[in-house]
């Protein structure tokens, strides 16, 4: 009976940068697979402790495993899998359809190095020439998961990539919030000056890259054919992406009512908890089922705005649908209409 | 943005406790993973402890039952209650944080914080 725990067992992590995190895959008698996160009775939401995960990341040479669970894209090769029984088993397994499998990730710690792994990449003249074509997202201000300028490395070449407001690039943009395992593409961050001056003070490995790439093609599948070597340009604007996995994110509580499960809606930026005002463009459910599940409730069970009759109420305003989609909330100084939440109470 | 800055450091006799915090700017979900690297002089950073979103923990084997790290409710902050201190303990702090998805997870460092063991 193959399961992870058997000293024959075969694994992989694959669609990173690193053997220690990725999708995982298993060899079984007919090849690679990958694993959906809806085996072994598992939703493809929700999933429990990694430390099950163990034996995978020690035989891939790696630390502790510090999270298992849904990818956060799914890539779908020709052959995935569902399993059923014990959790980590793979004796009982069907070929799942490609648009229904979700895959499962997997990350572990990275094993022991003298120094911490950076967010940045080595610097250029370190890759192999051989060493494929990859994307690195470079934060603009003191770090955020999933957010700011792009670098592009190819080979021992690597550099940021000149941007036009007119390039109508959007499936590029999908591509490469793809590509780095970061979701959707959502907007462009405000712009970037590639040839701004250099504080002499600036560590080494943040000084601008030897080159810079312009868009070749905005259709592109694979990164080898999206971009070509351009002269540094000394002014203009780089491309610079949110996508929609980024984090942090924004955090809510509600207030005020009989439970936790309702209340006002608060939204915390910083270290401030603060009012969330109503928006016209979030006026389906949607925001507040996410509302509710971040509580842990259950589903919506009613939301309604409050009269903001008084010209001093104040709050935050996110101009998303969904709370999640909301890199920064703006400040509201007057008529903040408030909006009461009542979740679905899980244990009433 | 990510920030992570540690506090709490400072000389303690051998035999003694010392609690480390690391908060994080920022408000961020819950299903981040934080924990506990150090670092002695002229020796390479090790792993100390970590503790996942949903509250399982991880020790290096040589601090196993005298360090014991927690997080608030909140989740954003850590702290690392060591007891029992050796001066092999003595080392640069560092608090660590990792942001993301299963199989998709960077990590982010705070600047390190000195703790020193000694009578």
């Known amino acids: 009976r193959l399961s992870w725990y058997d000293p024959d067992f075969q694994a992989r992590l694959t669609r990173s940068n690193s053997k220690c995190q990725g999708q995982l895959e298993v060899y079984l008698k007919d090849g690679w697979h990958m694993v959906c996160s809806q085996s072994w009775g598992r939703s493809s939401k929700q999933w429990e402790d990694p430390s099950q995960a163990s034996k995978v990341c020690q035989r891939l040479n790696c630390g502790v495993p510090l999270s298992l669970g849904p990818f956060l894209v799914t890539y779908t090769p020709q052959s995935s899998i569902i399993c059923y029984g014990q959790l980590g088993s793979f004796s009982n397994c069907s070929h799942s359809r490609n648009d229904m499998c979700h895959s499962l990730g997997l990350t572990c710690l990275e094993p022991q190095k003298t120094t911490p792994p950076t967010t940045r990449p080595p610097p250029t003249t370190t890759p192999e020439p051989t060493a494929p074509p990859r994307l690195q997202l470079v934060a603009q201000s003191g770090g955020q998961h999933c957010a700011g300028v792009v670098e592009f490395y190819s080979g021992s070449l690597g550099g940021t990539i000149s941007y036009e407001a007119q390039d109508k690039t959007q499936d590029l943009e999908n591509f490469l919030c793809n590509n780095l395992q970061c979701g959707s593409f959502l907007k462009h961050l405000p712009e970037t000056e590639a040839g701004r001056a250099q504080d002499p003070g600036e560590p080494r490995e943040h000084q601008p890259l030897p080159i810079q790439w312009k868009i070749q093609n905005s259709s592109c599948t694979s990164l080898e054919h999206c971009f070509r070597k351009i002269k540094p340009q000394k002014s203009g604007r780089v491309l610079a992406l949110l996508c929609s996995g980024f984090q942090p994110k924004v955090q809510s509580r509600l207030v005020g009512g009989s439970s936790i499960c309702e209340g006002t809606v608060e939204v915390r930026q910083g270290a401030q908890w603060a009012a969330l005002c109503d928006s016209s463009s979030a006026r389906s459910s949607l925001r507040w089922e996410e509302v509710c599940r971040e509580q842990q409730c259950g589903s919506v069970n009613s939301y309604r705005v409050l009269d903001a009759g008084d010209p001093t109420s104040r709050g935050l305003f996110c101009p998303h649908q969904k709370l999640s989609q909301c890199h920064e909330l703006w400040e509201r100084n007057s008529y903040c209409k408030k909006v009461f939440v009542t979740c679905q109470d899980p244990n009433p | 943005q990510v920030q992570l800055v540690e506090s709490g450091g400072g000389l303690v006799q051998p035999g003694g406790s010392v609690r480390l915090s690391c908060a994080t700017s920022?408000?961020?979900?819950?299903?981040?993973?934080m924990g506990w690297y150090r670092q002695a002089p002229g020796k390479e950073r090790e792993f100390v402890a970590l503790i996942r979103g949903g509250g399982s923990t991880h020790y290096a084997d040589s601090v196993k039952g005298r360090f014991i790290i927690s997080r608030e409710n909140a989740k954003t902050t850590v702290y690392l209650q060591m007891n029992g201190l050796k001066p092999e303990d003595t080392a640069v702090y560092y608090c660590?944080?990792?942001?993301?998805?299963?199989?998709?997870?960077?990590?982010?460092w705070g600047q390190g914080t000195q703790v020193t063991v000694s009578s």
């Open positions: 660590v944080i990792w942001l993301g998805s299963p199989g998709a997870m960077s990590d982010y």
């Open positions: 920022g408000s961020i979900f819950s299903t981040n993973v």
